[in-house]
Structures are given as C-alpha cells and as structure tokens.
C-alpha cells in the first residue's frame, strides 16, 4: 500500500488512476468504508464523512482516467487508509498527517529555550531532524529542545520528519529577541562626550517595555542605577536619572545614551536590561567605558587608563614621530624629565590604537598645555 505524508494545515492530493483514459465511475472511502466522494456522470457527489467540506477532486482530470482525492486544511485525525474503488479495483493509500509547532511564542528572548513538538498519528514512529539557521543539526522524537538560544538562531528552522522512508519538511520562523551586541567597549579621553548605543537585533511592529542601566564604576565598591526608562510603541521616556552623572537619553530607537563627560570616576562596566511586555525574562547588553588621562606634574609625565581593559593591551608614551619611550602592559606609565614637544599616550592592541591622548610638554620654565 502506498504511503503519503501530509502536513497539518496543508492540502494533500491522493492519486487514483484507471486503465481506461476516460471518465468512469469511482468512489473514495475511508478505512471504515464510509464514502467520502465519488461521481455520478460528470457530477461530484459527497458522502457522509467528516471530510465533507474539506474533500474535493479535479473534474478536469477525470477524462484522462485520473480521479484524485484532495483534502484541504489537513488535520492529524485525517490520518487513515483511503480506498479508491474504480473498474472493480481497489487502490489503497495510507495518509499520515504530521504537525510541528513551537512550544510557545516564536519570538523568544536570547538565552531562553526553544521546544519543538511533533504531533503525529497513533501508531506512527517518526524521527525528526531540525537544522538551525546557523547550520546546527538537532535530532529527536516527539519533542526537540534547544536550550540557550543565541542571536544566530534567529531565522528559518528547517525540520524534516521521516516515516516509512518518506519525508515531509516543515519550516518554522524563529525570532530571537536580543541586542545586536552582547557587549561593547567605548574608549574615551578624559573630558570627551560619551555615546552609548544599544541597537536591537530584531524589528517588531510595536515594542513596549521598560529598562534600566546599572553601572559598576571601577573605583566604586557597589553598582548603582544610572537611569530607568519606559518604552511605549518604540518611544522612549526617562523615568528616573541620577544627578551624577546626568545622562541624557534619545527619545527614539535605537536606545541611545549620552554621558556629557568621560571622567575617571565613571570608568567601568554597565549592564542595560530591557524587559519587554508579555515576555518573561530580560534582554541584556554589557557596555564598558575606558577613560584615558595624560598629565604632567613637575618632572613626571604620566599616562593612565581606568576601566575594564584587557591584559593584552599595551600603554605607551611617545614623543610625536619617534619610537615609544615606554610601552608596557600596565594601566599607568610615566616618563621622568620628558623632553619638550608633543607627547602621545597610546592604548593599543598589537599595534591597533584604541585610544590616544596628546599632551604638549613645554621647555622646563613653562607650564604644560593640554590640547
């Protein structure tokens, strides 16, 4: 007997062919011998089956000796053996209908779990294999689970259900709600304005929720809330902001914060959390601020950085257009009795300059100038 696999909600066409290439009488019945449909001359007739309003055939094919049974909006319970009676012959087709659904909403927060559940007819023993948008394969039976969803898991998941050497493919669109970057680092000279941006990695019609930026300054013993805000239909409104520093926030997406001045006491790490309406859990983005200061005190030229720098970074002091006088993996370097000229303080990663501050050293009888 022929096996046909169908997808819940789809349409299936079961074929039945007579040896005579002309319109003759045929009937489609289910395994309980209940008539589904047939013909009387050129008219389509329907029986008392549950499929009544969803069953159809193609009259245009009858003259060629083809009498298909079309079932629309398939349901799992449509799984059955269908019998086509034509020319004193019986053709049996076993239809197996499967459904694959995501356990919850298909919009999931980064870090959450995705569970795909297979609906299958009794007596079937299918296997399922799903391929994520980033090419990761997962296998399972009735349920498949993916924990700790990542941003790269956003997109179309392709799942193949295998039964009796036949397969049917499902496509499920998953949206992982996350910030574009899990972490970012901003390098600034002391006194410069700081811009923090938190772009989202997804677009939705309406976006409503609330958020907060907690800041752990390197010099502080505990973290503090710098700003809280609400998000209503993509419009941002500030609820509460600290007096020091006095952050400013953009009114539209992407979420955007401005710190008027980069100061050593602000250097550190922040965590922006965003709670979305009707979602359990929060989106997170880490942001880091590194601040550089170059100073000259009497005969000592010093360069310092504050904030979360990697132990890979090199801090250097050099006279413009000359080799570095000092270049160390430290957060402070200095030169005693620096010669007059424009000195550069450089924070670099294997030659890539991340932050630069210039300080003019005047001949010993003058005061230094900070451009």
């Amino acid at each position: 007997k022929k096996v046909v696999l169908g997808k819940k909600g789809d349409t299936v066409e079961l074929t039945c062919t007579a040896s005579q290439k002309k319109s003759i009488q045929f009937h489609w019945k289910n395994s309980n011998q209940i008539k589904i449909l047939g013909n009387q001359g050129s008219f389509l007739t329907k029986g008392p089956s549950k499929l009544n309003d969803r069953a159809d055939s193609r009259r245009s094919l009858w003259d060629q000796g083809n009498f298909p049974l079309i079932i629309k909006n398939l349901k799992i319970e449509d799984s059955d053996t269908y019998i086509c009676e034509v020319e004193d012959q019986k053709e049996e087709v076993q239809l197996l209908v499967f459904g694959l659904t995501a356990n919850s909403d298909t919009h999931l927060l980064q870090g959450q779990s995705l569970t795909l559940t297979l609906e299958s007819p009794p007596g079937s023993s299918p296997s399922v294999q799903c391929r994520s948008p980033r090419g990761k394969n997962i296998q399972g039976g009735k349920t498949l689970s993916v924990s700790q969803l990542e941003l790269q898991d956003s997109g179309t998941w392709t799942c193949t259900v295998l039964q009796n050497q036949k397969k049917v493919e499902f496509k499920i669109d998953i949206v992982v709600l996350a910030f574009q970057k899990a972490s970012s680092i901003v390098y600034k000279k002391e006194g410069e304005q700081v811009e923090f941006s938190f772009p989202l990695a997804f677009t939705v019609e309406k976006l409503t929720g609330s958020g907060e930026l907690w800041w752990q300054a390197e010099r502080a013993s505990s973290s503090k809330s710098w700003i809280t805000f609400d998000l209503k239909n993509k419009e941002v409104s500030v609820k509460r902001v600290t007096q020091d520093p006095k952050l400013q926030m953009g009114k539209k997406l992407p979420l955007h914060l401005t710190l008027p001045q980069a100061l050593p006491q602000y250097a550190g790490s922040g965590n922006l959390t965003l709670a979305l309406e009707a979602k359990t859990g929060k989106l997170h983005q880490e942001v880091n601020l590194v601040v550089m200061r170059a100073t000259q005190l009497q005969k000592n030229l010093t360069c310092e950085v504050w904030g979360p720098t990697s132990p890979k970074l090199m801090l250097s002091l050099k006279l413009e257009n000359k080799e570095a006088k000092v270049s160390k993996r430290e957060k402070a370097v200095w030169v005693l009795n620096p010669e007059a000229g424009m000195w550069q303080c450089l924070l670099s990663d294997s030659g890539q300059v991340l932050l630069e501050s210039n300080i003019k050293v005047l001949p010993t009888w003058s005061t230094p100038v900070q451009p």
């Epitope: 132990p311 570095a324 160390k328 993996r329 430290e330 990663d349 294997s350 030659g351 890539q352 300059v353």
Partner: antibody
C-alpha cells in the same frame, strides 16, 4: 585549527630586499596580531615586530626600524615581512607567529622561511 | 628594553631525572595592573619552529605533558621538567611580552647525560 604557511626559501644579494609571506588558513585572520621572529644559524630567537591585520597598525623592534615593513592583506589572509638593505648577518630563518589566546605568547608558528644573503 | 638571561646555556640530565632551567629578566615582567607575569617558555627541536609550553609564567599550554611546569614571579622564573624523556631533548627559550620590544632569552640546550 589555524595554520600559518610561509613562502619558500630565498637567496639574496647584499643590499637587496626580501619579502616573505605568511598565509593563515582555518580561522579568522584579522582577530589576532601576526609577529615576525628571526633566528640566525645556531643563534637564538629575535622578535622583529608585529602587525594587527584589523587596523594595519604595526610595532617594530628598534633594531629593525627603517629596514623592515610588515603588511597584511585581509582579502587573502596573508601577512608579509619585507626586509631591505640586506647584509650577510640577515641570513636566518624567518618565522611568522600568532598569539590566538589573547596574550602575546605565540601558540601558532609558521614553518619558517630560510633567507640566505650572499654575494 | 628588557633583557632576558637564561642559565645554564646547556644542561645534561639523565633520563627520568629532573631538569631545571632558569630565566632572569632585567626588569620585572609582573604587571601590577593585571597581576600577571608576562613570561612564556618555548621548546625548539632542530629544523622545527618553536613550540609554546608555558604562558603567564605558569599556565601550561593545552596538549603539553604535565611533566613541564613553570614557576616564578617578577624577575626570576624557572622551567622544570620533572622526569626527563628522550623526546625532551631540545633548546628551551623564555620570552617576555610585558613590554615592547618583546624579548627572548638566549636559549638553553638540554641533552641526555
């Protein structure tokens, strides 16, 4: 696993230049600095300089300043070291090396390129 | 510039015995900011590029046998091979990467007695 594959041996005349290539395969090229280290026959290791392929930023050892140029081509994942005004004491095996763990201890090395400077 | 000095220049040790190589830097390679010693040890066999054994003065590179260990801090460092094997015959180098220029020691040749 990342591999660094260097160009073949070179024989050069004093006063000329040599350009050695180092091609990275099996990983992201621009994420980590590529250093050049040389070793004269029977001698120790000598760091010449490095390049950050991401920015093209370089640092050279004072000894080679003005004679060495390190470049990188991201499109081909290749780093180059050019040494000019060659002299007989530049005869050495030249290695490219990469630190892929986030410090500058070199965990991946090229196989080495022998450069012979002889009149 | 930091100068690295190794001792001894060559060393002969019996199979199964302990081998110890010392390395001294002219300045401290311990970063007070990051509390890390920027010192590595390499093994080089004839006709081969060097192979990283130890980084951060005492962290063993993956795949390196546990008979190799590194110790020390500031300016004085030691590479120890607890039980010498035939395949350990090589030249060993220490390297500082605390400041530019990066510098290597002159090397220690290890042989079997």
């Amino acid at each position: 696993q990342v591999q660094l594959v260097q160009s073949g041996a070179e024989v050069k005349k004093p006063g000329s230049s040599v350009k050695v290539s180092c091609k990275a395969s099996g990983g992201t090229f621009s994420s980590y600095a590529i250093s050049w280290v040389r070793q004269a026959p029977g001698q120790g290791l000598e760091w010449m300089g490095w390049i950050n392929p991401n920015s093209g930023g370089t640092n050279y050892a004072q000894k080679f300043q003005g004679r060495v140029t390190i470049t990188a081509d991201e499109s081909t994942s290749t780093a180059y070291m050019e040494l000019s005004s060659l002299r007989s004491e530049d005869t050495a095996v030249y290695y490219c090396a990469r630190a892929s763990r986030g410090d500058d201890a070199f965990d991946i090395w090229g196989q080495g390129t022998t450069v012979t400077v002889s009149s | 510039d930091i100068v690295m000095t190794q001792s001894p220049d060559s060393l002969a040790v019996s199979l199964g015995e302990r081998a110890t190589i010392n390395c001294k830097s002219s300045q401290s390679v311990l970063s007070s900011s990051y509390n890390k010693n920027y010192l590595a040890w390499y093994q080089q066999k004839p006709g081969q590029p060097p192979k990283l054994l130890i980084y951060w003065a005492s962290a063993r590179e993956s795949g390196v046998p546990d008979r190799f260990s590194g110790s020390g801090s500031g300016t004085d460092f030691t590479l120890t091979i607890s039980s010498l094997q035939a395949e350990d015959v090589a030249v060993y180098y220490c390297q500082q990467y605390y400041s530019i220029p990066i510098a290597f020691g002159q090397g220690t040749r290890l042989e079997i007695k």
